[in-house]
Interface confidence: medium
């Protein structure tokens, strides 16, 4: 393979050059700074010691600035990914200057050469920051540094290297394969910049894990689990694109970081909050809504600068599609009693009624087990805002969808064959918006009718002690 | 290899309307602007207008801009460019040219449909 | 828009001489770009961001410039050269192209 950069970080590439044709070396890194949304307008590219480019390009000194660092690419070009982010960034911050960092020719390589080349992108993103740095008005905790995939090491990088320290760097999707556990100085860090946060949206904790699963930033979150990504399944990919396969589903997950970033500075007036979680599971139980002490954010641009102790690992649910955000309610169920339950987990659906909508009917996910004479907590979503909470439905489902639950009742019968039938009884469920943070408390219509059997539903309104806790603070408005 | 093959020559009556096509291979459609230049005989080159197929965004020449659509199908990879209320000097010749974003130029273009307006 | 004004309108040169085609912008433009267009073809590009040669084309042509005013030359013309050019800009929409040069045989 090429030498990737000579002793003036230059790309030295001597493969694939054309006979008699001119051979001009072009920088390795180079700076563009987006004078338009259009992809169409060239910009201006800006050098070290190069004063002329940022008076004919009206670099604004005192404004904010962006530098959008690309990952490592297979086909050598800016994906579209890109300009949908300059554009967002250039409508959101009017005034700012938005520069893109093109180090395509060190990223277009063997994945492993395109690592080794991050650190020198970063030495020259410092560079080009120190030289700023040198000009009158120029602050640097006035720069976001937003890196995609490989892109955010190289923020890291940079960050590390440069001569003071930056205000912000986002990491989105930061690349798993090669930092996966790496020491802090050879990966995206929290001392990189004042507030580093990051998006997590394809880590894997079986095979191979594109997206760095460790927390590296001052706030880590983990859309969906951090995981697998609505709309993004082979069928959602395969209805979308002409030919879909399983790299636009590695795509479609990766790159959904960036489209929840730029659902953030877009739509501004629907942001998504995220809130703080030991792991996937206990929020996946509905346990962690709280925004008492920081325990939620808004996620993307929008983020309120955290610097906490420990790195902080905060979760969310979200959409197919922009608009991302989510309704999070949190359910707690408080089963007194129940009868004859076998084997068998009960599978519940629940509706929820409101002033402005009703929901469509949501699975409430058994992440262990119903427990009796317990409050079971779940977690809900709904992709509508309700508004108030007035009534609820809560469904046992009847015939068994999997075949697996067949089985276990079938194992049931053969062992209880005179099994009387499976009974439930719940007298109120509580409700806790991740949104409002307000909570109330739902009582059975009927008190009388507690019970809830298979194939049953039972319905639930606002109980008359129907209560809001006073303490807690919302994320979009502080309740007294 | 890339390949833009555009649809055939157009005769219209003054007022009418046209849709040209330009359908894409060899590439992945949704990562290039498409553009529309058109030129009449003899003449220069006159660009008319661009769509992003990743996401449908326009943009056009404020000259066009009441008559011209810009549109795509992902699908079949192919864009269109429809030129609406036609004139008679609106007999020229229509090209689709691939543009690579932040790449900064038009690489390849299609082999061009002459349309013609007369009544 | 920005008006790009080619000179001269005609050129006419023998093979294996040097040609010197201009192009000037009635307002300051970051780059030039330069296409090479022969009867019944489509434009073909030649130099992009002014002075860079795009994959392909010889090096006897090359581009310079800056501001308002940009040249193309050709070292040596081949007889494959003789052809209409034309200089066209990004920096501002509408994106113009100038009204052409023609290098015939002489």
């Known amino acids: 393979s090429p030498v990737p950069f000579g002793p003036e970080g230059r790309l030295e590439d001597k493969l694939h050059k054309p006979k008699a044709t001119q051979t001009e070396v072009k920088p390795s890194v180079r700076f563009n700074l987006r004078t338009s949304k259009d992809p169409e307008h060239e910009g201006c590219y800006l050098s070290v010691g190069h004063s002329q480019p940022l008076e004919d390009c009206s670099f604004n000194m005192t404004a904010k600035t962006f530098f959008i660092i690309h990952g490592w690419t297979m086909s050598g070009i800016f994906e579209n990914w890109l300009h949908k982010l300059v554009s967002a960034l250039h409508t959101r911050e009017k005034d700012a200057n938005v520069v893109v960092v093109d180090w395509l020719p060190l990223a277009h390589q063997l994945y492993t050469d395109a690592v080794n080349n991050t650190r020198v992108v970063g030495h020259s993103i410092a560079r080009m920051l120190d030289w700023l740095q040198e000009k009158d008005d120029f602050s640097l905790g006035n720069v976001h540094l937003i890196g995609y995939s490989l892109g955010a090491h190289v923020a890291g990088y940079a960050g590390n290297f440069v001569k003071g320290t930056v205000g912000r760097i986002t990491g989105l999707d930061p690349a798993g394969p090669m930092f996966e556990g790496a020491d802090i100085h050879k990966r995206l860090s929290p001392d990189d910049a004042d507030f580093v946060d990051v998006l997590h949206t394809y880590t894997r904790s079986f095979g191979l894990s594109i997206g760095i699963q460790m927390p590296v930033g001052h706030i880590d979150i983990y859309p969906n689990g951090g995981d697998f990504q609505p709309g993004c399944g082979l069928n959602d990919v395969l209805g979308s694109i002409a030919y879909g396969t399983i790299t636009e589903v590695v795509k479609c997950e990766h790159e959904r970081a960036v489209h929840l970033f730029v659902d953030s500075l877009v739509n501004q007036d629907k942001p998504s909050f995220a809130f703080q979680c030991t792991d996937s599971n206990r929020f996946k139980k509905g346990i962690c809504l709280s925004c008492r002490k920081n325990r939620c954010n808004s996620i993307g641009y929008n983020a309120k600068k955290m610097r906490n102790k420990r790195n902080s690992k905060m979760y969310l649910k979200t959409r197919a599609g922009m608009p991302f955000r989510v309704y999070h309610y949190q359910m707690k169920i408080h089963v007194f009693s129940y009868k004859n339950m076998g084997e068998i987990e009960p599978t519940f659906y629940v509706t929820l009624y409101g002033t402005n909508a009703d929901s469509q009917t949501l699975p409430l996910e058994i992440v262990e087990r119903i427990e009796q004479n317990a409050t079971n907590t779940f977690l809900v979503y709904t992709e509508e805002d309700l508004g108030d909470l007035l009534k609820i439905q809560l469904t046992w489902e009847g015939a068994s969808q999997s075949w697996y639950n067949l089985w276990k009742e079938f194992r049931s019968y053969l062992s209880q064959p005179r099994n009387p039938g499976r009974e439930l009884n719940i007298r109120r469920i509580r409700v806790k918006s991740g949104e409002t943070q307000r909570k109330l408390t739902f009582c059975t219509e009927d008190p009388e009718n507690t019970s809830i059997s298979p194939g049953r539903e039972l319905w639930f309104r606002k109980c008359r002690d129907g209560w809001r806790m006073k303490n807690e603070t919302s994320p979009t408005v502080e309740l007294p | 290899q890339v390949q833009l093959v555009q649809s055939g020559a157009e005769v219209k009556k003054p007022g009418a309307s046209v849709k040209v096509s330009c359908k894409a291979s060899?590439?992945?459609?949704?990562?290039?602007?498409m553009h529309w230049v058109r030129q009449a005989p003899g003449q220069g080159l006159e660009w008319m207008g661009s769509?992003?197929?990743?996401?449908?965004?326009?943009s056009y020449n404020e000259k066009f801009k009441d008559r011209v659509t810009s549109t795509r199908d992902t699908s079949i990879s192919t864009a269109y460019m429809e030129l609406s209320r036609l004139r008679s000097d609106d007999t020229v010749v229509y090209y689709c040219?691939?543009?690579?974003?932040?790449?900064?130029?038009?690489?390849?273009w299609g082999q061009g449909t002459t349309v013609t307006v007369s009544s | 828009e920005i008006v790009l004004t080619q000179s001269p309108a005609t050129l006419s040169l023998s093979p294996g001489e040097r040609a010197t085609l201009s192009c000037r912008a009635s307002?300051?433009?970051?780059?030039m770009y330069w296409y090479q267009q022969k009867p019944g073809q489509a434009p073909r590009l030649l130099i992009y961001?002014?002075?860079n040669l795009a994959p392909g084309i010889p090096a006897r042509f090359s581009g310079s410039g800056s501001g308002t005013d940009f040249t193309l030359t050709i070292s040596s013309l081949e007889p494959e050269d003789f052809a209409v050019y034309y200089c066209?800009?990004?920096?501002?929409?509408?994106?113009?192209f100038g009204g052409g040069t023609k290098v015939e045989i002489k």
């Open positions: 060899g590439y992945t459609f949704t990562e290039y602007t």
């Open positions: 307002s300051s433009v970051h780059y």
């Open positions: 040219a691939r543009y690579g974003n932040y790449v900064g130029y038009f690489d390849y």
């Open positions: 066209q800009q990004f920096t501002s929409s509408p994106y113009t």
């Open positions: 769509i992003n197929p990743y996401y449908g965004g326009t």
């Open positions: 961001y002014t002075s």
